[in-house]
Interface confidence: low
C-alpha cells in the first residue's frame, strides 16, 4: 500500500517528497528516517533539516533538490540490497498534531551487470555521531503527528492508531507534496 520506488544496486535511489513553503525562506523542519513513520518523528533518522539548513545527515543520504523551495526529496547514493524498505518523510509543521507523514517504499533490484568493486568506505564516515547541539538527537526523534490519507494511500504501521483527517491538498504525481500556509 506504500508508494513504491525502484533502483538497481550501485545506482542512486530517488525518493520524492515536497512541500510548498508559506513564504520564500520560511522553511519547515523535515526528517527522513528508515522505516515507516513511527509514533514520534522519524524512528531512525538518516537526514534532517531545520528552518535554515540541513543539520544532520549520514553517509550516502543527500538532498539534491532545492530544499529551500520545499524539494526535500532524498537521494541515496550507491544503493545496496540492504537499502530496500520503507522510508519516512516527515514535514514537521509547527503545532500539535500538524505533522505530515509520507511512507515511501524503496525496492532495490540486483544490477543487470555486476559493477566493478568499489573501494570500501571509511567505517567512521558511515556512522557519524549524532549532533549534540540543541534540538538534535532523539529529542527530535519523538514527534507525534498526523497521518494523512494521500491519494496513493500511504499507510504507516500506526495508521489505525494515528488516523487524522488532515489531507494533503497538493500531491504531485512524482511523490508526496504538501502546501504550508
Amino acid at each position: 500500500s506504500e508508494v513504491e520506488y525502484r533502483a538497481e544496486v550501485g545506482q542512486n535511489a530517488y525518493l520524492p517528497c515536497f512541500y510548498t513553503p508559506a513564504a520564500p525562506g520560511n522553511l519547515v523542519p523535515v526528517c527522513w528516517g528508515k522505516g515507516a513513520c513511527p509514533v514520534f518523528e522519524c524512528g531512525n533518522v538518516v537526514l534532517r533539516t531545520d528552518e535554515r539548513d540541513v543539520n544532520y545527515w549520514t553517509s550516502r543520504y543527500w538532498l539534491n533538490g532545492d530544499f529551500r523551495k520545499g524539494d526535500v526529496s532524498l537521494t541515496i547514493e550507491n544503493v545496496t540490497l540492504a537499502d530496500s524498505g520503507i522510508y519516512c518523510c516527515r514535514i514537521q509543521i509547527p503545532g500539535i498534531m500538524n505533522d505530515e507523514k509520507f511512507n515511501l517504499k524503496l525496492v532495490i533490484k540486483p544490477a543487470k551487470v555486476t559493477p566493478a568493486p568499489t573501494r570500501q568506505r571509511d567505517f567512521t564516515a558511515a556512522f557519524p555521531r549524532m549532533l549534540t547541539t540543541r534540538g538534535h538527537g532523539p529529542a527530535e526523534t519523538q514527534t507525534l503527528g498526523s497521518l494523512p490519507d494521500i491519494n496513493l494511500t500511504q499507510i504507516s504501521t500506526l495508521a489505525n492508531e494515528l488516523r487524522d483527517s488532515r489531507l494533503a491538498n497538493d500531491l504531485r504525481d512524482s511523490g508526496a507534496t504538501i502546501r504550508i500556509g
Epitope: 523542519p29 528508515k34 522505516g35 515507516a36 513511527p38 509514533v39 514520534f40 518523528e41 524512528g43 531512525n44 533518522v45 538518516v46 531545520d50 528552518e51 549520514t58 524498505g85 520503507i86 514537521q92 509543521i93 509547527p94 503545532g95 500539535i96 498534531m97 556512522f127 555521531r129 549524532m130 540543541r134 534540538g135 538527537g137 532523539p138 529529542a139 527530535e140 526523534t141 519523538q142 514527534t143 507525534l144 504501521t157
Partner: antibody, heavy 114, light 112 residues
Framework: QIQLVQSGPELKKPGETVKISCKAS????????MNWVKQAPGKVLKWMVW????????TYADDFKGRFAFSLETSASTAYLQINNLKNEDTATYFC???????WGQGTSVTVSS | DVVMTQTPLSLPVSLGDQASISCRSS???????????LHWYLQKPGQSPKLLIY???NRFSGVPDRFSGSGSGTDFTLKISRVEAEDLGVYFC?????????FGGGTKLEIK
C-alpha cells in the same frame, strides 16, 4: 500485537556483570529506535539511552556512560543492556521501551547485594 | 537537566470523582519546531508504564476519553473526569523536548 519481552530477574554481587535482553515482536525491529529506562526503588524513572536500531548509534544520558553497554542483535530483534562492575546503586528494574516510549517491556529486576 | 515536578505526591479519590494532577517543568518544553513533548503515563503495581497522553493533550490508542491533558510552556495538567477502579496506580509525566529525557516523580492515585 506489539510486544517487548525482557529476560528474567537477576541477583548479582558487587563487581560482577549482568546482561539483560529485550526481544521485540509485532513490528519491524529496525524501523524503530529502542530506549532503556531505569527505575530504582523509591526513585524517579531515569532515561538511559536511545539507540538507533538501523545504524546502531546510541545517544546516552550522561549518567549512563562508562559501565553501561548497549547492543543489538537485529537478526533476532533483540536489544541488550550490559552493566559492568555492578554497584549496589544499580539495584533497580530496567525497562526497554520502543522508540517513542509508546510500548514498554515488562521490566527486568536486577538486585546487587553482597 | 530538565526537572519535572509533580503534585500532589498522593491523591486519594472516591470512585466517580474527578482527579487532577499537575506537572511543572524547570524550563519551557516548547521545542524549536513548535511542538511540546510532554507525555503522561500510568504505571500499575508490578507493571510497566503505559502511555496515556502524548504531546500534552492527545490520547494514545485505546485510552478512554475520561482522560484529558492540557497546559503549555512549563505548566501541565492531567485530568480524569470520573475515576474508575482500573485507573488506580502511579501517574508520571515525562518530557522529550530536551536531552536527557526526564520524568516526574509520580503521583499515586488511590481510593479514599
Amino acid at each position: 500485537q506489539i510486544q517487548l519481552v525482557q529476560s528474567g530477574p537477576e541477583l548479582k554481587k558487587p563487581g560482577e556483570t549482568v546482561k539483560i535482553s529485550c526481544k521485540a515482536s509485532g513490528y519491524t525491529f529496525t524501523n524503530y529506535g529502542m530506549n532503556w529506562v531505569k527505575q530504582a526503588p523509591g526513585k524517579v524513572l531515569k532515561w538511559m539511552v536511545w539507540i538507533n536500531t538501523y545504524t546502531g548509534e546510541p545517544t546516552y544520558a550522561d549518567d549512563f556512560k562508562g559501565r553501561f553497554a548497549f547492543s543489538l542483535e537485529t537478526s533476532a530483534s533483540t536489544a541488550y543492556l550490559q552493566i559492568n562492575n555492578l554497584k549496589n546503586e544499580d539495584t533497580a528494574t530496567y525497562f526497554c521501551a520502543r522508540d517513542a516510549m509508546d510500548y514498554w517491556g515488562q521490566g527486568t529486576s536486577v538486585t546487587v547485594s553482597s | 537537566d530538565v526537572v519535572m515536578t509533580q503534585t500532589p505526591l498522593s491523591l486519594p479519590v472516591s470512585l466517580g470523582d474527578q482527579a487532577s494532577i499537575s506537572c511543572r517543568s524547570s524550563q519551557s518544553l516548547v521545542h524549536s519546531n513548535g511542538n511540546t513533548y510532554l507525555h503522561w503515563y500510568l504505571q500499575k503495581p508490578g507493571q510497566s508504564p503505559k502511555l496515556l497522553i502524548y504531546k500534552v493533550s492527545n490520547r494514545f490508542s485505546g485510552v478512554p476519553d475520561r482522560f484529558s491533558g492540557s497546559g503549555s510552556g512549563t505548566d501541565f495538567t492531567l485530568k480524569i473526569s470520573r475515576v474508575e477502579a482500573e485507573d488506580l496506580g502511579v501517574y508520571f509525566c515525562s518530557q522529550n523536548t530536551h536531552v536527557p529525557w526526564t520524568f516526574g516523580g509520580g503521583t499515586k492515585l488511590e481510593i479514599k
